[in-house]
Every structure is written in C-alpha cells, then in structure tokens.
C-alpha cells in the first residue's frame, strides 16, 4: 500500500436545501484505470461510511441507488455532492481515495471538509 | 504567510450604508470561510455570520438578517461586508476573520464603523 | 442558540501564578468545537485553543485546554507579562457561532 496526496476544501457552508458539493482532488502517482472513493463522516469522535462508489477513469461514478451521493470526475478530481443534509449532519467530511487497478494499490486521505448545515427558518403560518 | 487586511475606517450617519472589505492571502481562498465579527466600544465580541467562499452561501446571524449582506470575490480573494440602515448602537470595531477546521484562525486587523449624526 | 457563561468575570493575578478560566455552554457543543481566544487592547483576538484541546500555532505551552459537552477549562499555568489580557471562548460547532463574554486577566 503506497501513500497518496488528497486535497479537498477546509470548509463549506451546505445550500438552504441541504445540498453540499466539494471536489476532492488526487495526485495520482501512475496511470490508475480503476479508483474508489468513499466519503467518511467524523463527528463527535465517531467515524462513518457517508457512501462509496468505485468507477473505471473515463467514467461516471456510480454510487448504489439509495445512497446521498452523487459525483462525477475529471482528470484526478471527483466532484462530489451530498444532499438530504440536515444541522444535525453537520460535520467533517473526508475523502478517501484509492487506486484499485493497475497495481501498486495506492491511498489517498484528505484532511477532510468540515460542511455546515443550516435548517431553514420555517415559515410562519398565513392565514388566508 | 496567512494575511486578512481590511479597509479603513468609516464614519456614516444614521440610515446609511458601510460596506467593509477583508483582503485575503497567503492561502487558498475559496477553501475556507469568512466571518464576521464585531466589537462595541468596551463591549465583547459579537459574532455576525459567515460567508463560505467555496460556494457563496451565506448565514446570517437572526438579529442582522435583512440588513446585512457578505459576499466574496474569489478573483481578488477579497470578502465584503455590507451594512444597511445604520444606527448608533452599530458604532463598533468590525472584524472579519478565516473560518477553518480550527475555528477562527486568522483574523483583520478591524475597521472602525461610527455611526454619528 | 448555545449560550456560552465564562467565569470569573475578572481574574486578578500575579505574574507567575496559575490562572482557570471556566466557559459553560448552555447545551452540549458539537465534535467539543469550542475555541479560546485572547484579546489585548486595541488588537484583534488571537486563536489560543481550538477542539477545546489542540494549540493553534505559535501558541507557547504554557496555555492549554480541557473540557467536553459544556463544560470546559483554559489554563495558563505559569502567567506571563503579555498574558494580561481579555480572553473569549466560542463554540463554532452549531449555527449560530457564539462567544461567550469574556474573562478580564488583570495584574493583582
């Protein structure tokens, strides 16, 4: 397993829709043909799988039907989106990179993004 | 190294707007956030919002929604903060300062606002 | 809103001495993001503390910080000359950010 740089934005604020996107790039040491990402939630100490999808280069990235993520890459850079986040998902959100094919296997961790949530205000009731 | 320089100070009256701008260097701007801090005269600080310079998307403290506006302009990594119907009880040093993993790691220098009639 | 308490109001201390600054939150802070700032006169704050326990940079170890959910603690275990100032602790975990109102550090 070789190291492998990942750079990704030190913080974003998520949209009033609870919608955040960051582009998490690689210095991709070879020419890789086959890469995962996975997006690792910390928060509270506690580290969790946010969703993971593996893709060949040239392609799009597929993650499974029912996950919050959706992405797309180009060259070495994945650009990411999570949606359904509410303030309590608040947190630090780290990229994981890995070179699956050709050998050597190479990883790659960001120091992760630490997203802001924002519930929206609700809207006061109107009487019509 | 890691600079926020800010604009010089206003004296507005009341009603009137101040728009304070808060240059960034010596780091990735749009990969952190921007606040905005202020300081009454021997008062504490009072944080106002933020700004993501990522994205744009902004959160304003309730009190100032409505009155205040932060933007940013990623080609002269430059954040601004905008302050409308002024009144005196809005007399006070403002700060803006980098939001990182780390909290507010870097800070302005501050921009007097005194709002006189 | 998380409401930050910091206690005492005014430290006054001798140069050498231990200073405990105490900075309650009105709810637990979320992932402990609770900063300690310090303030001198006519400057801007500066970053002493951050994740309630790791010093930022350039900040000399005789400051530290402990504490977890709503209770937390800066030390300063042998004061300094310069030390004398206003110290603020913030918690950046939940909208909005909030400071608390500050301990005034001065000489005895």
């Known amino acids: 397993c070789k190291a492998m740089h990942v750079a990704q934005p030190a913080v974003v604020l998520a949209s009033s829709r609870g919608i955040a996107s960051f582009v998490c790039e690689y210095a991709s040491p070879g020419k890789a043909t086959e890469v995962r990402v996975t997006v690792l939630r910390q928060a509270d100490s506690q580290v969790t799988e946010v969703c993971a999808a593996t893709y060949m280069m040239g392609n799009e990235l597929t993650f499974l039907d029912d996950s919050i993520c959706t992405g797309t890459s180009s060259g070495n850079q994945v650009n990411l989106t999570i949606q359904g986040l509410r303030a309590m998902d608040t947190g630090l959100y780290i990229c994981k990179v890995e070179l699956m094919y050709p050998p050597p296997y190479y990883l790659g961790i960001g120091n992760g993004t630490q997203i802001y949530v924002i519930d929206p205000e609700p809207c006061p009731d109107s009487d019509f | 190294q890691v600079q926020l320089v800010q604009s010089g100070a206003e004296v507005k009256k009341p009603g009137a707007s101040v728009k304070v701008s808060c240059k960034a260097s010596?780091?990735?701007?749009?990969?952190?956030?921007i606040s905005w801090v202020r300081q009454a005269p021997g008062q504490g600080l009072e944080w106002m919002g933020w700004i993501s310079a990522y994205n744009g998307n902004t959160n304003y403290v309730q009190k100032f929604q409505g009155r205040v506006t932060m933007t940013t302009d990623t080609s002269t990594s430059t954040a601004y903060m905008e302050l409308r119907s002024l009144r005196s009880d809005d007399t006070a040093v403002y700060f803006c300062?980098?939001?990182?993993?780390?909290?507010?790691?870097?800070w302005g220098q501050g921009t007097l606002v005194t709002v006189s009639s | 809103e998380i409401v930050l308490t910091q206690s005492p109001g005014t430290l006054s201390l001798s140069p050498g001495e231990r200073a405990t600054l105490s900075c309650r939150a009105s709810?637990?802070?979320?992932?402990?993001?609770l900063a300690w700032y310090q303030q001198k006169p006519g400057q801007a704050p500066r970053l002493l503390i951050y994740g309630a326990s790791s010093r930022a940079t350039g900040i000399p170890d005789r400051f530290s910080g402990s504490g977890s959910g709503t209770d937390f603690t800066l030390t300063i275990s042998r004061l300094e000359p310069e030390d004398f100032a206003v110290y603020y602790c913030q918690q950046y975990g939940s909208s909005p950010f909030t400071f608390g109102p500050g301990t005034k550090v001065d000489i005895k």
């Open positions: 709810q637990s802070v979320s992932s402990n993001y």
């Open positions: 300062a980098r939001l990182s993993r780390a909290g507010h790691d870097y």
């Open positions: 010596g780091y990735t701007f749009t990969s952190y956030g």
